[in-house]
């Protein structure tokens, strides 16, 4: 079926597979320090780690790529490990008006998958 | 903000930037001949290329993504070109009792963004 | 073990001022915000405000700007809430809840503390 | 400011029961709504946030769906610890607001 099914194991050793790693940054990182005033610091959660033959494919066309990848490696690209979900995140920020609050649904990773 | 406007001129030159491109494949490519009858060879089109500071952030998230790989390059890697958006494909294939079709919604890639 | 523990049930006459208290423990109080929500007598919740205890930065919901006063003091691990003149109207059960930003959920609860205001 | 109307204000189930709450955003809120229940002289509990996601160590029989401007909670088989009043929340952006609640009774 054109539903393979995508590997879980990661076949290059512990922790080389595309998986969620925490990134530490600050509004000063981001450049939003002019903006946001809370919280000063981000945990940003982050898709890293390379993406082998159906490791966590995130649908058919992934698996595609990844076949064709094997077949002709300069013309198709592999995979690569992106977010598969978000964690929405409040962030308390500067308005014309004062302070407001709002919520951020694409900002931090919540899992990933091979695309 | 931190919806700062993903770029779409590529920097990189025509063609280098993360864009659709046509691979062309069989159902031997795919591995499909012994369950797909037709088509026989697919217009497969895929995502490639670079994903240069900014140009055409998928989110937020990627944008983070992007300036934090300039940051720290080693821990953070940089967007990758991925579909934005599929285009169903029918598929005529043989079952138990004969042939059916099937329509595949996440096979083709229509569109590509930086994530 | 993390909680959130508000100060004792208050009883006050109209235009008094009060001050009720929610000691955070068992976390980084500063690592997060603490919302205040009422409950008028057999009613529903309401949001009232909201604080980073790190910052000191204070958003209330329109419904209580100017009514009552969200503070906090770091040193101590404890948020307040207060009012300067009580009327009869601010009865009410009154929870303090700590804020994920992650998620952006009340994941602590305080106990709630009862504040009747009758002459 | 966004105002979030729940329906039904009450309902009477039976143990064992599917029960469905509804709630509606006055503008789209993407999925940043939460669920929480609470019961008589006790706080609210948060059962669902994000929507969809089931907070850590509430049963799977709580269920929460929708995004834009109209989400479900869903109690699969309503059990006799269920009983209670749920409110959904919104914290797309300030000023959050609750629903106006849904009282779960026996029937």
């Known amino acids: 079926s054109a539903h393979a099914h995508p590997r879980d194991s990661c076949p290059l050793g512990p922790g080389r597979c595309c998986h969620l790693e925490t990134v530490q940054a600050t509004l000063e990182d981001l450049g939003w320090s002019d903006w946001v005033l809370s919280p000063r610091q981000l945990q940003l959660s982050m898709c890293v780690g390379e993406c082998p033959h159906l490791y966590r494919s995130a649908n058919t066309h992934a698996q595609i790529k990844a076949r064709l990848h094997g077949l002709q490696p300069d013309k198709v690209p592999a995979p690569c490990c992106v977010p598969s979900s978000y964690t929405p995140v409040v962030l308390m920020h500067r308005t014309d008006s004062g302070v407001s609050l709002q919520t951020y649904d694409d900002l931090v990773a919540r899992g990933c998958h091979c695309a | 903000s931190a919806h700062a406007h993903p770029r779409d001129s590529c920097p990189l030159g025509p063609g280098r930037c993360c864009h659709l491109e046509t691979v062309q494949a069989t159902l031997e490519d795919l591995g499909w001949s012994d369950w797909v009858l037709s088509p026989r060879q697919l217009q497969l089109s895929m995502c490639v290329g670079e994903c240069p500071h900014l140009y055409r952030s998928a989110n937020t998230h990627a944008q983070i993504k992007a300036r934090l790989h300039g940051l720290q390059p080693d821990k953070v890697p940089a967007p990758c070109c991925v579909p934005s958006s599929y285009t169903p494909v029918v598929l005529m294939h043989r079952t138990d009792s004969g042939v059916s079709l099937q329509t595949y919604d996440d096979l083709v890639a229509r569109g590509c963004h930086c994530a | 073990e993390v909680q959130l523990v508000q100060s004792g049930a208050e009883v006050k006459k109209p235009g008094e001022s009060l001050k009720i208290s929610c000691k955070g423990s068992?976390?980084?109080?500063?690592?997060?915000?603490i919302s205040w929500v009422r409950q008028m007598p057999g009613k529903g919740l309401e949001w009232m405000g909201i604080i980073d205890p790190s910052g000191s930065y204070t958003i209330y919901s329109p419904s209580f700007q100017g009514q009552v006063t969200i503070s906090a003091d770091k040193s101590i691990s404890t948020a307040y809430l207060q009012w300067s003149s009580l009327k009869a109207s601010d009865t009410a059960m009154y929870y303090c809840?700590?804020?994920?930003?992650?998620?952006?959920?009340?994941?602590?609860w305080g106990q709630g503390t009862l504040v009747t205001v009758s002459s | 400011d966004i105002q979030m109307t729940q329906s039904p204000s009450s309902l009477s189930a039976s143990v064992g029961d599917r029960v469905t709450i509804t709630c509606r955003a006055s503008?789209?809120?993407?999925?940043?709504l939460n669920w929480y229940q609470q019961k008589p002289g006790k706080a609210p509990k948060l059962l669902i946030y994000?929507?969809?996601n089931l907070q850590s160590g509430v049963p799977s029989r709580f269920s929460g769906s929708g995004s834009g401007t109209d989400f479900t909670l869903t109690i699969s088989s309503l059990q006799p610890e269920d009983f209670a009043t749920y409110y959904c929340?919104?914290?797309?952006?300030?000023?959050?607001?609750f629903g106006q609640g849904t009282k779960v009774e026996i029937k």
């Open positions: 068992g976390y980084s109080f500063t690592d997060y915000w």
């Open positions: 994000a929507a969809s």
């Open positions: 809840a700590r804020v994920s930003y992650y998620g952006g959920y009340f994941d602590i």
């Open positions: 929340f919104q914290l797309d952006h300030s000023p959050f607001t």
């Open positions: 503008q789209s809120i993407s999925n940043n």
